[in-house]
């Protein structure tokens, strides 16, 4: 008789999750010499230990501490790029501007990017059928708690001028409920972070509006200013040209507004 299994509203653990995490870890440590000391088997064991045999709606940041410790990584604190709802462009940017880092350019972010995982209470099984959805089931699920934990630490580590890429095509350019709006903004350290500079990425070719005047950007400005961090905002009217100019800053067309 098949054992009863909890049905959750979200997709199940990504296929070949253990193999994927291990392979990503090996690849990352080969590419990044400063992380060559990392033992990927230990990293997987710590990752697994955070959620296996635990109720997938009762995961805490504490569960991830062994993994956080193993994945400790120093990134230049003044080279951090945050993003919200525009991951692909942010990643394209850091692939070109190699001295800047998104969370997914760090070991822990790279390991988990685009993956889903959860376990079951009191069994050592990984649940490949379904995992809790943040809205419909519970917020303290393995994936959400992981991203909350690593995002908080990433924001806490930032200094000087921190950049954030925001999607100007969305109805809420700044969304208080996003990871950026609910976690990262509130964990920037005012004694270390001088300025948060928002880059609002335009979607339409002919969109010449100043999206820095959007009410949600004003809301972000207010939150940041209350924390005694300076705020700055730039419109990126042409993201394609923006990336091109990052690649070739000497190009004569790159002096005009992008």
């Amino acid at each position: 008789v098949p054992r009863w299994r909890q049905q959750w509203s979200g997709p199940g653990t990504t296929k070949r999750f253990p193999e994927t995490v291990l392979a990503r870890c090996v690849k990352y440590t080969e590419i990044h010499p400063e992380m060559r000391h990392v033992d990927c088997q230990s990293v997987w064991d710590a990752f697994k230990g955070a959620f296996i045999s635990k109720h997938p709606c009762n995961i805490t940041e504490e569960d991830y501490q062994p993994l956080m410790k193993l994945g400790t990584q120093t990134v230049p604190c003044n080279k951090i790029l945050l993003w919200s709802r525009i991951k692909d462009l942010a990643h394209q940017f850091t692939q070109v501007q190699r001295d800047m880092f998104t969370l997914e350019d760090t070991l822990l972010g790279y390991l988990a990017d685009d993956l889903t995982w959860c376990g079951e209470f009191n069994t050592s099984k990984i649940n490949y059928q379904s995992c809790p959805d943040w809205r419909k089931d519970c917020s303290n699920n393995p994936v959400s708690v992981f991203w909350k934990t690593v995002s908080r630490r990433f924001a806490e580590a930032a200094c000087d001028v921190v950049h954030v890429m925001l999607n100007g095509s969305r109805s809420k350019i700044f969304d208080k409920n996003s990871t950026f709006g609910s976690v990262e903004v509130h964990n920037l350290q005012p004694e270390k972070v001088q300025t948060l500079e928002a880059w609002v990425i335009h979607g339409g070719r002919e969109d010449s509006r100043d999206l820095c005047q959007d009410p949600t950007i004003k809301e972000l400005e207010s939150i940041i200013s209350k924390r005694n961090i300076q705020f700055s905002c730039k419109n990126i009217y042409r993201p394609d040209k923006f990336l091109q100019c990052v690649k070739n800053p000497e190009d004569s067309s790159c002096t005009s507004e992008i």
């Epitope: 400790t72 990584q73 120093t74 990134v75 230049p76 604190c77 003044n78 630490r153 806490e156 580590a157 200094c159 000087d160 001028v161 350290q189 004694e191 270390k192 001088q194 300025t195 500079e197 200013s225 005694n228 961090i229 300076q230 705020f231 700055s232």
Partner: antibody, heavy 116, light 111 residues
């Protein structure tokens, strides 16, 4: 290029007030906070505090709460330091210095002498 | 407040030799692997000039003869080789914790 240009030397009597200016050029003043640093004759450097040039909110180190006021006039890209009820021990060179927490850009300094 | 103690208070070095200044802090100035310790050079009648930021990063335009190292509570500024125009006062400064604080300074003279 980025420059911070301060007002000239001042000779003041005890009890008077002085206002030192720091004009920023080569960048947008409101993008970076402005710090003030004091150096008494033959002495080391003391951080007095900073002003958030975006919101205008000042932060003072404990030893500089009370008689010291940081202010701004963004229309002329200038930060100000005002000292009231001057005392002989306020005699020093006062520097403005641009953020971040390490100061890559400094004004040339303003010597304030308090003497009767 | 974090107290910064520099040593020595002064030193005399011959041109071509190495000068080493240390700065010890009363508590760690590290955060997530970054050390918030900075070094300045000040010549008479001039404002301080940033040499090294965050313990080991050479400020743009500063000669590679200057280098910084250290972490947590112990930091070093090295000038190697020393040149005649390196005569100046040198200060360390932390920005890990408000209020920012400076060391008392080290006077470097060239023999």
């Amino acid at each position: 290029q980025i420059q911070l240009v301060q007002s000239g030397s001042e000779l003041k009597k005890p009890g008077a007030s002085v206002k030192v200016s720091c004009k920023a050029s080569g960048y947008n003043l409101t993008n970076y906070g402005m710090n003030w640093v004091r150096q008494a004759p033959g002495q080391g450097l003391e951080w007095m505090g900073w002003i958030n040039t975006y919101t205008g909110e000042p932060t003072y180190a404990d030893d500089f709460k009370g008689r010291f006021v940081f202010s701004l006039d963004t229309s002329v890209s200038t930060a100000y330091l005002q000292i009231s009820s001057l005392k002989a021990e306020d005699t020093a060179v006062y520097y403005c210095a641009r953020y971040p927490g390490w100061f890559a850009y400094w004004g040339q300094g303003t010597l304030v002498t308090v003497s009767s | 407040d974090i107290v910064l103690t520099q040593s020595p208070a002064s030193l005399a070095v011959s041109p071509g030799q190495r000068a080493t200044i240390t700065c010890r802090t009363s508590e760690s100035v590290d955060s997530y692997g970054n050390s918030f310790m900075h070094w300045y050079q000040q010549k008479p009648g001039q404002p301080p000039k940033l040499l090294i930021y965050r313990a080991s990063n050479l400020e743009s335009g500063v000669p590679a003869r200057f280098s910084g190292s250290g972490s947590r509570t112990d930091f070093t500024l090295t000038i190697n080789p020393v040149e005649a125009n390196d005569t100046a006062n040198y200060y360390c400064q932390q920005s890990n914790e408000d209020p920012w604080t400076f060391g008392q300074g080290t006077k470097v003279e060239i023999k």
